[in-house]
Amino acid sequence: LIIGFGISGRHSITVTTVASAGNIGEDGILSCTFEPDIKLSDIVIQWLKEGVLGLVHEFKEGKDELSEQDEMFRGRTAVFADQVIVGNASLRLKNVQLTDAGTYKCYIITSKGKGNANLEYKTGAFSMPEVNVDYNASSETLRCEAPRWFPQPTVVWASQVDQGANFSEVSNTSFELNSENVTMKVVSVLYNVTINNTYSCMIENDIAKATGDIKVTESEIKRRSHLQLLNSKAS
């Protein structure tokens, strides 16, 4: 969480941002809140990006003001206009691109004063893994697949029964570049699997950590997946 204060002759207002991550090709949110004002027409929101000389987005007098928007954000940004009056200056960023990563500033002007806060935005690709029993294999084998990751993640297998065991000798992980030549499909195979055990396939890069669990018994197979974004800090 980053909390910023204005430093003008006017009073300062508190602006709060939260570091976040965007999944390339999907829509993302850059979070920013501020002390609200009673009049929408008195609120100005400017989003800026370090190293980019045009604006990311501007909202003033109750509507978008895009004359100074940088080309790299053309047609991809929006604020939640109906929530500005209650102090929400968050930015929706459509079709997140790798180059969107960087330091953003949420700058606010209201009748009470000015304030700003920075936000670190990471971009990459992350997806839920799915673990299945590979019936085609000669021995009991598990196959963990996740369709989109970037940068290249690490894959670690774990088991409930053999806690702390190192499965690197009995697993094989491959990364296959997807058609857009950035993200990769992750496939990891675990051999010599025993029945009545829960196995976890953990995929992690500096943006996200995802886990796919599979419980294999003689009578059933249970699966569960979980994804967590890393480094979501507020400012």
Partner: antibody, heavy 116, light 107 residues
Framework: QVQLVQSGAEVKKPGASVKVSCKAS????????MNWVRQAPGQGLEWMGR????????NYAQKFQGRVTLTVDTSTSTAYMELSSLRSEDTAVYYC?????????WGQGTTVTVSS | DIQMTQSPSSLSASVGDRVTITCRAS??????LNWYQQKPGKAPKLLIY???RLHSGVPSRFSGSGSGTDYTLTISSLQPEDFATYFC?????????FGQGTKLEIK
């Protein structure tokens, strides 16, 4: 007030290179992109590329890619445009122009003549 | 690249006339359309940016309108100093592209 002052006219032989300068004053040099636009005699305007003075990052028009180099010297608030492998069709007035989306201030222009 | 087609290429008019120049883009340029005036031997000067915003110091007889692909520059009452060449330019996407120009001459 904002001013962009360009270097003087140049006469070059085919195959040579030319480097034109554009000295900015009256504003913070690193706050605005610097574009380069040329105009052949009696012709229209042609955008060549732009440079981000704060990062040195560049964008070039496809037509000039590999032949034009845009640089800046932030210590003197000066932008440079170097065009190599000159041919007669490069005879034109070369302008520097400030900003993104539109060009609010222009240099006075530098005439480059390419002749054997 | 986005193609910009300006018309007419030349135009004769008298002082006091109302004049309109049009510019058509080959695709939607989301109002990122600018107009410049250029006099012989001089650099272009920005008149209007973002379709209809008057650049500082530009007389109010100049106005711009349009949306999507079609844009217009209007001079409500021509003054002697307005006889020049006018260019449109799209700033929606790189590379910037310009119309071929409209030469406004005295009738």
């Amino acid at each position: 007030q904002v001013q962009l002052v360009q270097s003087g006219a140049e006469v070059k032989k085919p195959g040579a290179s030319v480097k034109v300068s554009c000295k900015a004053s009256g504003y913070t040099f690193t706050d605005y992109y610097m574009n380069w636009v040329r105009q052949a005699p009696g012709q229209g305007l042609e955008w060549m590329g732009r440079v981000n003075p704060s990062s040195g990052g560049t964008n070039y028009a496809q037509k000039f890619q590999g032949r034009v180099t845009l640089t800046v010297d932030t210590s003197t608030s000066t932008a440079y445009m170097e065009l190599s492998s000159l041919r007669s069709e490069d005879t034109a007035v070369y302008y520097c122009a400030r900003r993104h989306n539109y060009a609010d201030f222009w240099g006075q222009g530098t005439t480059v003549t390419v002749s054997s | 690249d986005i193609q910009m087609t300006q018309s007419p290429s030349s135009l004769s008019a008298s002082v006091g006339d109302r004049v309109t120049i049009t510019c058509r883009a080959s695709q939607d340029i989301s109002n990122y359309l600018n107009w410049y005036q250029q006099k012989p031997g001089k650099a272009p000067k920005l008149l209007i940016y973002y379709t209809s915003r008057l650049h500082s110091g530009v007389p109010s007889r100049f106005s711009g309108s349009g949306s999507g692909t079609d844009y217009t520059l209007t001079i409500s009452s021509l003054q002697p100093e307005d006889f020049a060449t006018y260019f449109c330019q799209q700033g929606n996407t790189l590379p910037w592209t310009f119309g071929q120009g409209t030469k406004l001459e005295i009738k």
